[in-house]
């Protein structure tokens, strides 16, 4: 696994412990919390990052209307179970034996149950809608410049293949970035849209996962873009399975008539 040889750190994941104990004295980095060896030439999976985070000390509309099956991560942080490849296990349980099924980005897609709950497969999140509101700026953003800059960001910083950035919508002050990646489209070595979205989410919260870099400085023709709020919608290849109770107001949170809750990331 590649890492910076000189000081043996992981450029793409600061939540690691690195040492020159790889083959031939090469630098090898392991994710905090899980001890899994990570590839520092690409993004670390969201599952391993969440696990590391939990182990760390605490401190005329042109915009897209989210599909009725869109999920939003309303449950917040949890300590996930990851498979040997670093993917989320389809079934997640907490210490009190409450279990639920998740999608490939680790967001709950069923009601909570007990240990008898079955999650047959890990359902892929194939469409992610990142909804941002930017802070007022002295100079206006041109849509095509903004589009180009965001595509460049996902390509260069998150190493996401350009074909997976489906669209960038802009209706001041709202920006929407659509990421799409079907199972059949994702080749070996391709960054997962869920991982790219998670790195981006942490960046816009001022919690960069990259080693030793300052915060993300995003500019459009020199004009800085500052994000005031972020909301991320996840759409799965198979719609989520929630009981009617949740849809008719019995569930927690807002937006009870849709298969999502509005969860604001500040």
């Amino acid at each position: 696994h590649t890492a910076a040889q000189d000081n043996c750190t992981c450029p793409t994941n600061k939540m690691t412990v690195c040492s020159p104990d790889g083959p031939g004295g090469r630098c090898q980095c392991r994710a905090l919390g899980s001890g899994v060896a990570v590839d520092c030439s690409t993004l670390t999976s969201k599952c391993l990052l969440l696990k590391a985070r939990m182990s760390a000390p605490k401190n005329a509309r042109t915009l897209v209307r989210p599909n009725e099956h869109a999920l939003v991560d309303n449950d917040g942080l949890y300590d996930p179970d990851c498979d040997p490849e670093g993917r989320f296990k389809a079934r997640q349980c907490n210490q009190t034996s409450v279990c639920w099924c998740v999608n490939s980005v680790g967001v709950r897609r069923t009601d909570k149950g007990d240990l008898s709950l079955r999650c047959d497969e890990l359902v892929r999140t194939h469409h992610i809608l990142i909804d941002l509101r930017h802070r007022p700026t002295a100079g206006a953003f041109n849509h095509s410049d903004l589009d180009a800059e965001l595509r460049r960001l996902f390509r260069e910083r998150y190493r996401l293949h350009p074909k997976f950035v489906a669209a960038v919508h802009y209706e001041q002050p709202t920006i929407q970035i659509e990421l799409r990646q079907n199972t059949s489209q994702k080749a070996a070595g391709d960054v997962d849209i869920g991982d790219a979205a998670y790195y981006f989410e942490r960046d816009v919260k001022g919690e960069s996962l990259f080693q030793g870099r300052g915060g993300l400085d995003l500019r459009v023709r020199g004009e800085p873009l500052q994000v005031e709020r972020t909301l991320i919608y996840y759409l799965d290849e198979i719609p989520p399975k929630f009981s009617m109770k949740r849809l008719t107001g019995g569930g927690s949170g807002g937006g009870s008539h849709h298969h999502h809750h509005h969860h604001h990331h500040h």
């Epitope: 001022g206 023709r221 800085p224």
Partner: antibody, heavy 122, light 106 residues
Framework: QVQLVQSGAEVKKPGASVKVSCKAS????????INWVRQRPGQGLEWMGW????????KYAQKFQGRVTMTVDTSTSTVYMELSSLRSEDTAVYYC???????????????WGQGTLVTVSS | EIVLTQSPATLSLSPGERATLSCSAS?????IYWYQRKPGQAPRLLIY???NLASGIPARFSGSGSGTDYTLTISSLEPEDFAVYYC?????????FGQGTKVEIK
């Protein structure tokens, strides 16, 4: 540490041009914009414009449009501000200042160069 | 253009006293930036994004406000705090500064 060092004082005749340099060090030069601000004797601070070294984008104050030109030399991490058609009212101390920003915050103008006194006199 | 009006123009206080400087904008702005300038020196950033202390600035300085009214407070004046203070907006072009408030020793 981040530092901006400006060229020395200049004395110019009315109608002439002046070119002030600002050399940056201690940070990735292309990662923030360089602003120019002047202070005339006994007056307040007046923003003239900025240039973004990464792509050469620039924004000038309307008041100076047509008279000011900001350029960048990335090989030497230097920004230049040229003011033409000088008049006596342009006598001032000219400052360069960098502005760092992230998606979370705009960190203001910090630090500033030491200032360059430009005197316009016949 | 947005005009920033600072008051008072001059503030005469003694070391140890509390200084309250005001900055009023001609139209609503989202954030204000505060700078200190001493004779023969370049301005120094004190506060960014209305209330955040710039690097290396003592905690006796604080900023607050919203809309059109903003305040810089120095909780207990030190001898080195006697200077001219400027507010600045980044809401619309041209970027503008207030005319300054001079804090002098009484």
């Amino acid at each position: 540490q981040v530092q901006l060092v400006q060229s020395g004082a200049e004395v110019k005749k009315p109608g002439a041009s002046v070119k002030v340099s600002c050399k940056a060090s201690g940070y990735t030069f292309t990662s923030s914009d360089i602003n120019w601000v002047r202070q005339r004797p006994g007056q307040g601070l007046e923003w003239m414009g900025w240039i973004y070294p990464r792509d050469g984008s620039k924004k000038y104050a309307q008041k100076f449009q047509g008279r000011v030109t900001m350029t960048v030399d990335t090989s030497t991490s230097t920004v230049y501000m040229e003011l033409s058609s000088l008049r006596s009212e342009d006598t001032a101390v000219y400052y360069c200042a960098t502005r760092f920003a992230t998606v979370v915050s705009n960190y203001g103008l910090d630090p500033w160069g030491q200032g360059t006194l430009v005197t316009v006199s016949s | 253009e947005i005009v920033l009006t600072q008051s008072p123009a001059t503030l005469s206080l003694s070391p140890g006293e509390r200084a309250t400087l005001s900055c009023s904008a001609s139209s609503s702005v989202n954030y204000i930036y505060w700078y200190q300038r001493k004779p023969g020196q370049a301005p120094r950033l004190l506060i960014y994004d209305t209330s955040n202390l710039a690097s290396g600035i003592p905690a006796r300085f604080s900023g607050s406000g919203s809309g059109t009214d903003y305040t810089l407070t120095i909780s207990s004046l030190e001898p080195e705090d006697f200077a001219v203070y400027y507010c600045q907006q980044w809401n619309s072009y041209p970027l503008t500064f207030g005319q300054g408030t001079k804090v002098e020793i009484k």
